[in-house]
Interface confidence: medium
Amino acid sequence: SSPTSSASSFSSSAPFLASAVSAQPPLPDQCPALCECSEAARTVKCVNRNLTEVPTDLPAYVRNLFLTGNQLAVLPAGAFARRPPLAELAALNLSGSRLDEVRAGAFEHLPSLRQLDLSHNPLADLSPFAFSGSNASVSAPSPLVELILNHIVPPEDERQNRSFEGMVVAALLAGRALQGLRRLELASNHFLYLPRDVLAQLPSLRHLDLSNNSLVSLTYVSFRNLTHLESLHLEDNALKVLHNGTLAELQGLPHIRVFLDNNPWVCDCHMADMVTWLKETEVVQGKDRLTCAYPEKMRNRVLLELNSADLDCDPILPPSLQTS
C-alpha cells in the first residue's frame, strides 16, 4: 500500500539524523526525512523543521536545496560531502537556521554551487576558509557566483574579541577563491567600515549590497577595479559625505547604479563637490530624494536644490577663543 507520487509535485519524507558521508547512495526517488522533494524541479525543501544537522540522505538529483528555518548551529567541514557527490547542487539556502559557526571546508565537494544564502544566522564564528576550503594562499576557484550574507551579525555579547567586519572579509578573501563572485549582499550587519582591500580582490562583482549598515565614510574604499559593477546599495548607512576620489571612481564605472537613500548627509562646505556631482551624474538612483540631516538649519533640504552659498562651514575658532 505504499503510495506513489507524481514527479512534478513535492513529495516528502519525515523524521531523523546522525553520521557522516553515507556509505550507500540513496535511492534515486528517496526523499530525506522531514523534507519535501520534487525530482522534476530538482528541488528539496527541508524548511522550518528544527533540523539540527544537514540530512545525510539527500537525493543526487538535487539542484536547489532549502534548509531554512532550522536549528543547525554548526556547519562542519564537508557538511554536504556525499558519495557520490551532490554534483548538481547549484543553489543552497541556509537562511534563518540558527547557525553560529561555519567551519573551514563546510561547502567543499559541491562543484556546481553557484548561489549560497547564509542570511539571518548569527555567525559568531565564520572560518576564514569557509568558502575557500583550504588555507592555501591561492585556493581552487570557488564556483560561487552569488553570496548572500545579510544580517549575519551576532548579538554583541556573542561576538569574538575581533572585528566582525574583519572576520567576514577574511572569509571573502581567503585563497582568492571568490574571484568569480558576481553578487555579494552584506546588508544589515552593523558594519562600521569596509576594509580597504576587500573590493579590489573581488573583480567580477556586478552587484554589491551594503545597505542598512553603519558605514560612516568610504574614504579608504576603492571601487576602481570593479569595472563590471552594476549596482551598489549604500542606503540606510551613516554616510555624511562622499569625497572627490570616491565620486570620480563611481563616475568612471561604465554600468553602475548607486543607491544612497536614507543617509545622514552633512550639508556644510565639504558637501559642495558631492552636490555638484549629483547635479551632473546619472549614476545615482533617486538622487532627488537625498536630503540633508545636519546641520540643524539644513535639515530636510534636498541636496539637488542646494547651491554653494548654502554650504558653509562655521569658522574654526583659535584655541584662545574656544569655550567649553
Epitope: 539524523l17 528517496q30 526523499c31 522531514l34 540522505d57
Partner: antibody
Framework: EVQLVESGGGVVQPGRSLRLSCAAS????????MHWVRQAPGKGLEWVAY????????YYADSVKGRFTISRDNSKNTLYLQMNSLRAEDTAVYFC?????????????WGQGTTVTVSS | DIVMTQSPDSLAVSLGERATINCRAS??????????MHWYQQKPGQPPKLLIK???NLESGVPDRFSGSGSGTDFTLTISSLQAEDVAVYYC?????????FGGGTKVEIK
C-alpha cells in the same frame, strides 16, 4: 503480503540490556525507512526511533537518546533496537513500523509488537 | 515538542450515526504543499492501522466512511456511519518534526 514480525522482548531487570529484532518480508526492505514505536500498558503511542533506508540517518526520542540504538541489516531484511540501561518506564509493547521513502504518508505497516517488561 | 491534543477522550455513538474526532497541534504541521497529519485505528490486542495519511488521503483498503480534513493546527477524523467493527481507539500523529508525537487517543464505543 507485507509482514513485520518483532521478537526479542521479555522480562529484564533495570539497568540491563535487551535487543529487539523486526523481520520484514513481502516488500523491498532496503527501500523504506523504519521506526520503533512503543505503547506502555494502558497508555497511548510513543514514537521511539527511526532509521533511513540506507542507515545514513537516525533519530531518537529524547526519552531514549543515549541508551537505545536503532540499526538495520538490509541483507537480512531485519531492523534492530538495542536497548541499554533499561528503566521501569521503558516497559511497553514495542512495535516496528514502516514509512514510505516519501514520508508524508504516515506509518503504513506495523508489526504485532513484542512486550518488554523492566522490573526488579 | 509539538503537543497533539485529541478530543473527546471517549465517544459513544449509535450505529449508523456520525462520529467526529478532533485533533489540535500546538503549532502548524502543514507546509504550503502538504499536511503532515495522520490518523490510526487500534483495536484491543492489535497494532495500530493507518487510516488517513496527510490529513485527508484514505489509505488503501480503508472503507470510505472514514474521512479526514484540516490543515495547519486543526484536524478532524469523521466516521460518517458508525459500524460495529469501528469500535476502537483512534490516534492522530504528526510527522512534521522530531519527535513525532501522537494524540492521547479517542475511544469510540457503541451507544
Amino acid at each position: 503480503e507485507v509482514q513485520l514480525v518483532e521478537s526479542g522482548g521479555g522480562v529484564v531487570q533495570p539497568g540491563r540490556s535487551l535487543r529487539l529484532s523486526c523481520a520484514a518480508s513481502g516488500f523491498t526492505f532496503s527501500n523504506f525507512g523504519m521506526h520503533w514505536v512503543r505503547q506502555a500498558p494502558g497508555k497511548g503511542l510513543e514514537w521511539v526511533a527511526y532509521i533511513s533506508s540506507g542507515s545514513s540517518t537516525f533519530y531518537y526520542a529524547d526519552s531514549v537518546k543515549g541508551r537505545f540504538t536503532i540499526s538495520r541489516d538490509n541483507s537480512k531484511n531485519t531492523l534492530y533496537l538495542q536497548m541499554n540501561s533499561l528503566r521501569a518506564e521503558d516497559t511497553a509493547v514495542y512495535f516496528c513500523a514502516r514509512s514510505p521513502a516519501y514520508y508524508r504518508y504516515g506509518l503504513d505497516y506495523w508489526g504485532q509488537g513484542t512486550t518488554v517488561t523492566v522490573s526488579s | 515538542d509539538i503537543v497533539m491534543t485529541q478530543s473527546p477522550d471517549s465517544l459513544a455513538v449509535s450505529l449508523g450515526e456520525r462520529a467526529t474526532i478532533n485533533c489540535r497541534a500546538s503549532q502548524s504541521v502543514s507546509s504550503s504543499t502538504f499536511s503532515y497529519m495522520h490518523w490510526y485505528q487500534q483495536k484491543p490486542g492489535q497494532p495500530p492501522k493507518l487510516l488517513i495519511k496527510s490529513s485527508s488521503n484514505l489509505e488503501s483498503g480503508v472503507p470510505d466512511r472514514f474521512s479526514g480534513s484540516g490543515s495547519g493546527t486543526d484536524f478532524t477524523l469523521t466516521i460518517s456511519s458508525l459500524q460495529a467493527e469501528d469500535v476502537a481507539v483512534y490516534y492522530c500523529q504528526h510527522s512534521w518534526e522530531i519527535p513525532y508525537t501522537f494524540g492521547g487517543g479517542t475511544k469510540v464505543e457503541i451507544k
